[in-house]
């Protein structure tokens, strides 16, 4: 053996070095990689170095047993069965309330025969649900509406307005509440007329006297 | 009838560990999460987190994580909570209880609850 | 997570009047639950997903709200509806409750 080099190094199973004839001179750098399936334990980079001892042990390769963390989901909660995810595992998602799962909600960690463990799908996605709308309310008679539309988007609000010469009578505004099924937060409003409002309300009848009969009204009626 | 039974009370030392139980009946107990929730003596109220019988999965309110561990006996129906590294803190009333489906978000039954003492 | 604010912390009323109490979001809630809670003993589901009575509910009582604000109502007050009421919601994990309002019979 020459005594002007590191020791030769040698093929670790499940696995290959780079390069495969490394020069074994002072400085030379040797990457050791694992195949599909395996991974890499102890220091994957070895360094010949001025001593002409390597500058770490020889790695090896284990074979991998579990799924990589397939990570959270926005407006979810998940429930993991092992924390390390090895195959076998599961996690499942659940959106929150007003969210929609689009995907997957459990995944299950698969071994390969090639390869690393996979899990069964991607992760899902929850989405926004999309509410119902409302659907128009007519306008009071004597009175307006705006916007005038037949669906109002959930959350939206209308309001309502009477023709001159009428009060309204209920809320001048009303709201689409979200929900399943959106609704109205009020009954629609009515319009009234000023004046029988006022009559009702604070009059009282007068009867003024007759004058006195002639025939000449008498011919009028 | 559905019905969430819990195990009695305890008294506990500083630093312990406490398992509890609660024992479904009623309906299919793999048919549903169960949930564990506390409510300390300011009669607040948190969810600890929660465990689906059939796969054994859990997910823990972030503030429980290192507190509690929650798993099940699916041959007797029977969800448990172990809380480790008492304090005095962890004194409450802990409650099992159940959602209606998974497209629920509200606790439709709930254990009579498990007082639970810390103290030297 | 959403924190849950509810007033007030405690309020009493006589029989037959009408009660409010409200429940304020950190952040805004698609829905909000409500659970009675006496005193010895478990919460029960009291209205859920905002305005649905639970079986059992007198008609009494009415939810109502959206976005950050919510509210439950008694019409009118009975005897029997002296306790404390909690709100909740999950439209963000980890749920989270309010603090309650405990209801006292003048």
């Known amino acids: 053996p020459r005594n002007d080099t590191c020791p030769e190094l040698p093929e670790i199973p499940n696995g290959w070095k780079s390069p495969s004839q490394p020069e074994l001179v002072h400085g030379t750098v040797v990457t050791y990689q694992c195949y599909p399936g395996y991974q890499v334990v102890g220091s994957s980079v070895l360094m010949c170095q001025w001593d002409l001892t390597w500058s770490e042990d020889l790695p090896s390769c284990q074979r991998v047993t579990s799924c990589h963390d397939p990570g959270d989901v926005e407006h979810s909660r998940r429930l993991i069965s092992s924390p390390k995810f090895p195959v076998g595992a599961t996690v499942q998602y659940i959106c929150d309330q007003g969210f929609v799962l689009m995907g997957s909600s459990i995944l299950t960690c698969h071994d390969r025969q090639a390869g690393s463990p996979k899990w069964s799908d991607r992760a899902p996605k929850c989405l926004l649900e999309q509410l119902k709308p409302c659907h128009g309310l007519s306008a009071p008679e004597n009175g307006a509406r705006s916007p005038e539309k037949q669906l109002h988007p959930a959350g939206a609000t209308i309001h309502f307005s009477c023709a001159p010469g009428y009060v309204l009578k209920g809320q001048a505004s009303i709201k689409c509440v979200p929900g399943h099924p959106s609704h109205w937060s009020d009954p629609p409003p009515i319009c009234r007329a000023a004046s029988l409002d006022g009559f009702y309300n604070s009059r009282s009848l007068d009867v003024a006297k007759a004058p006195a009969a002639s025939s000449t009204l008498d011919a009028a009626h | 009838e559905v019905q969430l039974q819990q195990s009695g009370p305890e008294l506990m030392k500083p630093g312990a560990s406490v398992k509890m139980s609660c024992k479904a009946s009623g309906y299919t107990f793999t048919d549903y999460n169960m949930h564990w929730v506390k409510q300390n003596q300011g009669k607040s109220l948190e969810w600890i987190g929660e465990i689906n019988p059939n796969t054994g999965g859990t997910g823990y309110n972030q503030k429980f994580k290192d507190k509690a561990t929650l798993t099940v006996d699916k041959s007797s129906s029977t969800a448990y909570m172990e809380l480790r590294s008492l304090t005095s803190e962890d004194s409450a009333v802990y409650y099992c209880?159940?959602?209606?489906?998974?497209?629920?978000?509200?606790?439709?039954?709930w254990g009579q609850g498990t007082t639970l003492t810390v103290s030297s | 997570q959403i924190v849950l604010t509810q007033s007030p912390a405690i309020m009493s009323a006589s029989p037959g009047e009408k009660v409010t109490m409200t429940c304020s979001a950190s952040s805004s809630v698609s829905y909000m639950h409500w659970y009675q809670q006496k005193s010895g003993t478990s919460p029960k589901r009291w209205i859920y997903d905002t305005s649905k009575l639970a079986s059992g509910v007198p008609a009494r009582f009415t939810g109502s709200g959206s976005g950050t604000s919510y509210s439950l109502t008694i019409s009118s007050m009975e005897a029997e509806d002296a306790a404390t009421y909690y709100c909740q919601q999950w439209s963000s994990s980890p749920p989270t409750f309010g603090a309650g309002t405990k209801l006292e019979l003048k």
């Open positions: 209880a159940r959602i209606p489906s998974l497209r629920r978000y509200y606790f439709d039954y």
